[in-house]
């Protein structure tokens, strides 16, 4: 693979990662695939500092991140360990709420208007953030 040393045009560099912020919405799976086609992944939040950075750029808008529990346990799309990692859920969340009437529960995580996280129906068309790491040889993203 080829190593990327600077971020592509229209991406924002921060702490050796590149971020791209959508301005329109897609379902979580479409957003996930979109990032993969950019040789990136949905954003994985590993620290309070990164949380603040992303929150600053997205504003008070529901925005998908690379965290889901569609196969059971919560998983980050890049393999980062969920249990030991950074979390910023809203109080009482995640709740896998079934009361929305859309069928099933809530399996995909997003930033809410105050930046804290909520689980929601994966089909909702929210904005999303792609992330790719600098100084890392390009490789196939991990399978879900």
């Amino acid at each position: 693979g080829s190593e990327r040393t600077c971020c592509p045009v229209n991406w924002v560099e921060h702490e050796r990662s590149c971020y791209w912020f959508s301005r329109s919405g897609k379902a979580w799976a479409d957003a996930d695939n979109y990032c993969r086609l950019e040789d990136a992944h949905l954003v994985v939040v590993t620290s309070w500092e990164e949380q603040k950075f992303v929150q600053h750029h997205i504003g008070p808008v529901n925005t998908w991140m690379g965290l889901h529990d569609q196969n059971g346990p919560w998983k980050w799309v890049d393999g980062t360990d969920y249990e030991t990692g950074f979390k910023n859920w809203r109080p009482e969340q995640p709740d896998d709420w079934y009361g929305h009437g859309l069928g099933g529960g809530e399996d995909c995580a997003h930033f809410t208007d105050d930046g804290r996280w909520n689980d929601d129906v994966c089909q909702r068309p929210y904005r999303w953030v792609c992330e790719t790491e600098l100084d890392k040889a390009s490789q196939e993203p991990p399978l879900l």
Partner: antibody, heavy 123, light 109 residues
């Protein structure tokens, strides 16, 4: 000049294989996802497959999954489509196209197309 | 995935006419809608992207509109070179499987 040029089409028997190539010029090939689209005679375009700029991510239409393989050689600015277990319904003109996304273009669209190469599957 | 339906499938018109082609999505696709023109023996050519934005080099007589599920392509005054087949495409789904409409063939009356 931005250009895509397909080659490799021809007549093949059912069950046979064929490899299509698409030579790109005039843009930074490795920066763009690339796609294959086919068009059966008298029909509309049908998306077939897409590959990310590095080649690390690939996607396929259900109709070709497990039979077709998309790949690219960025050192040669070339896109490929390996087709196997070909069927009569795969008969079509095959186009390669640049898939420009809104990360680098003002749109998500297939903005540059080749002239197409004809694949005929018949005994 | 989202299914796209175009109407009419064919249309006869004269030079100078104003024509409108419609495209309907099976669910909301926001503004993820492109229009292509294709002439016999040629590849499709991008005309309109993001529902209403004109691709560079495309004449201003072409315009697009709509959002959500219903979209239109309008040609304000048909020119001889506009007789072709027009396709809509959604890029809401990634990858864009079943993304093209079935086409509208614009013929000379």
């Amino acid at each position: 000049e931005v250009q895509l040029l397909e080659s490799g089409g021809g007549l093949v028997q059912p069950g046979g294989s064929l490899r299509l190539s698409c030579a790109a010029s005039g843009f930074t090939f490795s920066s763009y996802a690339m796609t294959w689209v086919r068009q059966a005679p008298g029909k509309g375009p049908e998306w077939v497959s897409v590959i990310s700029g590095s080649g690390g991510s690939t996607f396929y239409a259900d109709s070709v999954k497990g039979r077709f393989t998309i790949s690219r050689d960025n050192s040669k600015n070339t896109l490929y489509l390996q087709m196997s277990s070909l069927r009569a319904e795969d008969t079509a003109v095959y186009f390669c196209a640049r898939y420009c996304s809104s990360t680098r273009c003002p749109y998500d669209a297939f903005d540059i197309w080749g002239q197409g190469t004809m694949v005929t599957v018949s005994s | 995935g989202v299914q796209m339906t175009q109407s009419p499938s064919s249309l006869s018109a004269s030079v100078g006419d104003r024509v409108t082609i419609t495209c309907r999505a099976s669910q909301s696709i926001s503004g993820y809608l492109n229009w292509y023109q294709q002439k016999p023996g040629k590849a499709p050519k991008l005309l309109i992207y993001a529902a209403s934005s004109l691709q560079s080099g495309v004449p201003s007589r072409f315009s697009g509109g709509g959002s959500g599920t219903d979209f239109t392509l309008t040609i304000s005054s048909l020119q001889p070179e506009d007789f072709a087949t027009y396709y809509c495409q959604q890029t809401y789904n990634t990858p864009p499987e079943r993304s093209f409409g079935q086409g509208t063939k614009l013929e000379i009356k």
